[in-house]
Amino acid sequence: EVEKTACPSGKKAREIDESLIFYKKWELEACVDAALLATQMDRVNAIPFTYEQLDVLKHKLDELYPQGYPESVIQHLGYLFLKMSPEDIRKWNVTSLETLKALLEVNKGHEMSPQVATLIDRFVKGRGQLDKDTLDTLTAFYPGYLCSLSPEELSSVPPSSIWAVRPQDLDTCDPRQLDVLYPKARLAFQNMNGSEYFVKIQSFLGGAPTEDLKALSQQNVSMDLATFMKLRTDAVLPLTVAEVQKLLGPHVEGLKAEERHRPVRDWILRQRQDDLDTLGLGLQGGIPNGYLVLDLSMQEALS
């Protein structure tokens, strides 16, 4: 906190310029008018102030805008944005995508800070949904952004926004998140032809149900093993050996290397050994010949 003192004669700032770096903290407090600062915030971003001097400037803005800064000031905060607390940011009403981009640029290359998380939350809530332009912007700065959202938050993503999603944006998503995103992706890409559709839908398949995997197996898609290993186990188990063979195409040979890992391990346990042998991969652990398999879940459903 800088002590309140009168501005020395001749030192009253008429504009925000480089000469202010030569002001002591108390002089900045006494000689820089907060309203002038607010209207010339863009200039602050071109002047090499020390962190201590910036603290004084922030304090002046806080006094001028106790209810929260207007967007005209927010857009030009620059480094000062990193000095804001989440509580400060919750007072803001940010509606412009340009403002959002300008503030994300300041934090570029760093992890998502609490300030950034709060800013994004305020922005998205203000818009009512995560539209395509916003999603484009956020995933460009933070590829893992989508996967940081809860399934409930993801439900507000319109299918049209899915076009902005890149495969790397989904790298850290868990199955619950993909369960929400997959139906949106299916809807978004529904008018594409077979091979193009598969390229787009591939990274969302961790949320696909069995019937969609069966349908894909009829389309010569040649799914790679990395994608197959990310499928829901409960969606893979009902697939027949023939269906998995068609789904994977030439990649089917990769099953051998993954036979101890889910979902391959669990799928093998559900197949007849005879059927597994037809693949010629030496997969072991299937149901021995002559054994009868009772599906108890089906029996319970009937009774």
Epitope: P48, L54, H76, G78, K108
Partner: nanobody, 115 residues
Framework: LQLVESGGGLVQPGGSLRLSCAAS????????IGWFRQAPGKEREGVSS????????NYADSVKGRFTVSRDNAKHTVYLQMNSLKPEDTAVYYC??????????MGQGTSVTVS
């Protein structure tokens, strides 16, 4: 990202030193740079500044005519040439930079003793 100052040391009154400010992990070319100093027990004060192009320079009254700030963007370095040094110039000297979108960096300082 940080700035690294060098060139400080012990010098006699009336002597000269040239301080350097270089970037670590990025290039300084589009950063405006300010030189600051802090004497023991005193507040940090501005000494000089130079724009990103080098076309605009400013000095504190206490160093005008004695200190010169310059930059060599090919070497990604900013210099502070200090002549006619006085005992009251004794301090730790820091450089601070501001780049695109108001991104800020600051160095750890280099010590100058005039005695």
């Amino acid at each position: 990202l940080q700035l690294v100052e060098s060139g400080g040391g012990l010098v006699q009154p009336g002597g000269s030193l040239r301080l350097s400010c270089a970037a670590s992990g990025f290039t300084l070319d589009n950063y405006a740079i300010g030189w600051f100093r802090q004497a023991p027990g005193k507040e940090r004060e501005g000494v000089s500044s130079i724009s990103s192009s080098g076309g605009s320079t400013n000095y504190a009254d206490s160093v005008k005519g004695r200190f010169t700030v310059s930059r060599d963007n090919a070497k990604h370095t900013v210099y502070l040439q200090m002549n006619s040094l006085k005992p009251e110039d004794t301090a730790v000297y820091y450089c601070a930079g501001v780049g695109d979108y108001g991104r800020r960096v600051m160095g750890q300082g280099t010590s100058v003793t005039v005695s």
